[in-house]
Amino acid sequence: CKAMHVAQPAVVLASSRGIASFVCEYASPGKATEVRVTVLRQADSQVTEVCAATYMMGNELTFLDDSICTGTSSGNQVNLTIQGLRAMDTGLYICKVELMYPPPYYLGIGNGTQIYVIDPEPCPDSDF
């Protein structure tokens, strides 16, 4: 089988601080040393990139400084955290894994994690 399988949880509930974490695991058919992990958000038929990181196997996952994502990697498993989420960001978040180097290239796309975000209720004014 030449396809690369990617597994991720079906549903995740973001914390009251707007933080959601999930694991993205891939079954690598090749011996990649360089891997790219991308989080995509799918709304209707539109797919947009949320964040992406390229890492060397055995090294840490590094997102850009201004990214809303952070993560760690361990073997073929990536622990992803997305922060700054609001209710309007509720949606399907897809984990895409690409084995970049050495060739051959492999693409793996998860089924997506539905992240639910609930904005916290504002604190009532105190009369004290």
């Epitope: 030449k2 396809a3 895409k96 970049m100 180097y101 060739p103 051959p104 796309i109």
Partner: antibody, heavy 118, light 108 residues
Framework: QVQLVESGRGIVQPGRSLRLSCAAS????????MHWVRQSPGKGLDWVAF????????YYADSVKGRFTISRDNSKNTLYLQMNSLRAEDTAVYYC???????????WGQGTLVTVSS | EIVLTQSPGTLSLSPGERATLSCRAS???????LAWYQQKSGQAPRLLIY???SRATGIPDRFSGSGSGTDFTLTISRLEPEDFAVYYC?????????FGQGTKVEIK
């Protein structure tokens, strides 16, 4: 809207070189991997080469490996294909295509014809 | 590499009829990584279907894709005059990226 425009068409003799360009507009070029695909007259589609968004990693079809070089200049929103040691069997319409977020080739240029003949 | 074989080579049909095109992979190509393209004479290919069954932006719902594993199908429910063209399947799950040899849908 996404637009890809190839240039560099021409008739060249076997063994000579030619460089194709693909000017991109309507999207953030530096965020997308790019492909070259060719189509010989009256034939099907053949993938030629791929380059990552940052230009670091490149892949080639066996038929062009060692002869063709794919490159890009993200500051100019342009993709290139340097073709050396051209052969008659390289005669084709060459298309540049964008690798979509989910993997398929979601946008294509109009193509440019390269004829290798003595 | 994954070899894709399309059948039939040519399909002769009339407008309004249903077209069924087949694409068989030499080894399992995950359904997430199978696309269909349409190419009209003298034009560039156009993405119709990706992930075996998802329609690309702006593609009419008379086009549908199905299948998994090694067998995939493109169906055009009712052929319109502008649908007569060549159709290619493609796998994009690993390099080298490969295309089928194409199926020509012509007017009967």
């Amino acid at each position: 809207q996404v637009q890809l425009v190839e240039s560099g068409r021409g008739i060249v003799q076997p063994g000579r070189s030619l460089r194709l360009s693909c000017a991109a507009s309507g999207f953030t070029f530096s965020s997308y991997g790019m492909h070259w695909v060719r189509q010989s007259p009256g034939k099907g589609l053949d993938w030629v080469a791929f380059i990552w968004d940052d230009g670091k990693n490149k892949y080639y079809a066996d038929s062009v490996k060692g002869r063709f070089t794919i490159s890009r200049d993200n500051s100019k929103n342009t993709l290139y294909l340097q073709m050396n040691s051209l052969r008659a069997e390289d005669t084709a319409v060459y298309y540049c295509a964008r690798k979509g977020q989910l993997g398929p080739f979601d946008s294509w240029g109009q193509g440019t014809l390269v004829t290798v003949s003595s | 590499e994954i070899v894709l074989t399309q059948s039939p080579g040519t399909l002769s049909l009339s407008p309004g009829e249903r077209a069924t095109l087949s694409c068989r992979a030499s080894q399992r190509a995950g359904s997430s990584y199978l696309a269909w393209y349409q190419q009209k004479s003298g034009q560039a290919p156009r993405l119709l279907i990706y992930g075996a069954s998802s329609r690309a932006t702006g593609i009419p719902d008379r086009f549908s894709g199905s299948g998994s594993g090694t067998d995939f199908t493109l169906t055009i429910s009712r052929l319109e005059p502008e649908d007569f063209a060549v159709y290619y399947c493609q796998q994009y799950g690993n390099s080298p990226w490969t295309f089928g040899q194409g199926t020509k849908v012509e007017i009967k």
